[in-house]
């Protein structure tokens, strides 16, 4: 909407608002050690941080949600930080016949916004 | 992923988990009274509720996020309830020449999931 403007500067201080962060995880963490061969250690980007009023609003719905959360905080939740896009990654799988490569399009976040 | 299964039954009790809810709002609430016409309150559907482990997971990323949140709750946030789809709605706008209709594709949520 032309009448509510999302903003990109974080009013809470550096690193506090919704952003992409790299998290290390092992195959054991994910419960994947029996069916994924590699990589043994995964670098996963995830969306973390808060979504203060109008920060990185995903769309009109998120702008409205932010506004109504300010008015009815018990009824309407604040927008939250979720992936806006993903980057494809390849995992090496064990299969009955040996090993295969499989691409996952929705495993690692590439960008974040407040929805 | 075939190895983490999203689930659809809420372990927290009825109405507690991520779902669609109708919220009433006035034009004044939204700051729209100068440019939108409406004889009555607006009805908006929004996604509210919690996202317990594997509930309505949006995709592989959300399944992983849920798992890592269990292991590193301070580092990785739990998935949160956001729109999975939107329903197009029409707003009546005031214009210099009178009134016109405009369709918004991203204003009202139609379905919800945990991302």
């Amino acid at each position: 909407s032309a009448h509510l403007h999302p903003r990109d500067s974080c009013p809470l201080g550096p690193g506090r608002c919704c952003h992409l962060e790299t998290v290390q995880a092992t195959l054991e963490d994910l419960g994947w050690s029996d069916w994924v061969l590699s990589p043994r250690q995964l670098q996963l980007s995830m969306c973390v941080g808060e979504c203060p009023h109008l920060y990185r609003s995903a769309n009109t719905h998120a702008l409205i949600k932010a506004r109504l959360h300010g008015l009815q905080p018990d009824r309407v939740p604040a927008p939250c930080c979720v992936p806006s896009s993903y980057t494809p990654v390849v995992l090496m799988h064990r299969t009955d016949s040996g090993v295969s490569l499989q691409t996952y399009d929705d495993l690692v976040a590439q960008g974040c916004h407040c929805a | 992923s075939a190895h983490l299964h999203p689930r659809d039954s809420c372990p927290l009790g009825p109405g507690r988990c991520c779902h669609l809810e109708t919220v009433q709002a006035t034009l004044e609430d939204l700051g729209w009274s100068d440019w939108v016409l409406s004889p009555r309150q607006l009805q908006l559907s929004m996604c509210v509720g919690e996202c317990p482990h594997l509930y309505r997971s949006a995709n592989t990323h959300a399944l992983i996020k849920a798992r890592l949140h269990g292991l590193q709750p301070d580092r990785v946030p739990a998935p949160c309830c956001v729109p999975s789809s939107y329903t197009p709605v029409v707003l009546m706008h005031r214009t210099d020449s009178g009134v016109s209709l405009q369709t918004y594709d991203d204003l009202v949520a139609q379905g919800c999931h945990c991302a």
């Epitope: - | 669609l20 109708t22 034009l27 939108v36 016409l37 409406s38 004889p39 009555r40 309150q41 607006l42 009805q43 559907s45 329903t87 197009p88 709605v89 029409v90 707003l91 009546m92 009178g98 009134v99 016109s100 209709l101 369709t103 204003l107 009202v108 139609q110």
Partner: antibody, heavy 123, light 108 residues
Framework: QVQLVQSGAEVKKPGSSVKVSCKAS????????VSWVRQAPGQGLEWMGG????????NYAQKFQGRVTITADESTSTAYMELSSLRSEDTAVYYC????????????????WGQGTLVTVSS | SYELTQPPSVSVSPGQTASITCSGD??????VSWYQQKPGQSPVLVIY???NRPSGIPERFSGSNSGNTATLTISGTQAMDEADYYC??????????FGGGTKLTVLG
């Protein structure tokens, strides 16, 4: 493409009720507003009320308030209109009509119509 | 309640322009839609929001709206345009209101 298929013609006694159904196919049922519009023989169109499945709320024209009930069953993509305390003046063709959700107005811009259901009220 | 007034009938020769009016208090500040209904058939939306046509509606249908009158114009009227036409808007509480309808007769 979108189709609205209504239930068949009805003959009713004065004082009784009638329930007409409208089954939608094509498009997302919950994402639209469904209205009921009637047309007495040789007369014009008259809006009775409507429902928006996603909000679960119905609105009625003042004239029919208290006598008409409009409901929707999302699982079958079907809308219903029940009119009670029927009188001879209720003899008409009843149409269901679908349109976009118009925020604050809810109904109008009827871009798809059912084939109509003739309800005859006679003793 | 808000009232829309239409002439009961309008006649036009084939190929000529037909104008069907819809009068209402300050209707120029309302959104108006027009529906066509042929005998024994369901209505069809032909014009909405001043002069927008749904897909499949010929370009010869257009609309205008100012002051107290909205007008549906059919240029180069054809025999197939013979039908009843209804205007529609909303009252002050947001209820749908239809005009009484106009029967368009294409002469000849």
């Amino acid at each position: 493409q979108v189709q609205l298929v209504q239930s068949g013609a009805e003959v009713k006694k004065p004082g009784s009720s009638v329930k007409v159904s409208c089954k939608a196919s094509g498009g997302t049922f919950r994402s639209y507003a469904v209205s009921w519009v009637r047309q007495a023989p040789g007369q014009g169109l008259e809006w009775m009320g409507g429902i928006i499945p996603i909000f679960g709320t119905a609105n009625y024209a003042q004239k029919f308030q208290g006598r008409v009930t409009i409901t929707a069953d999302e699982s079958t993509s079907t809308a219903y209109m029940e009119l009670s305390s029927l009188r001879s003046e209720d003899t008409a063709v009843y149409y269901c009509a679908r349109g976009p959700i118009i925020m604050g107005y809810q109904f109008g811009l009827f871009d798809h119509w059912g084939q109509g259901t003739l309800v005859t009220v006679s003793s | 309640s808000y009232e829309l007034t239409q002439p009961p009938s309008v006649s036009v020769s084939p190929g000529q322009t037909a104008s069907i009016t819809c009068s209402g208090d300050n209707i120029g500040s309302h959104i108006v839609s027009w529906y066509q209904q042929k005998p024994g058939q369901s209505p069809v939306l032909v014009i909405y929001d001043k002069s927008n046509r749904p897909s499949g509606i010929p370009e010869r249908f257009s609309g205008s709206n100012s002051g107290n009158t909205a007008t549906l114009t059919i240029s180069g009227t054809q025999a197939m345009d013979e039908a009843d036409y209804y205007c529609q808007t909303w009252d002050s509480i947001g209820s749908v209101v239809f005009g009484g309808g106009t029967k368009l007769t294409v002469l000849g």
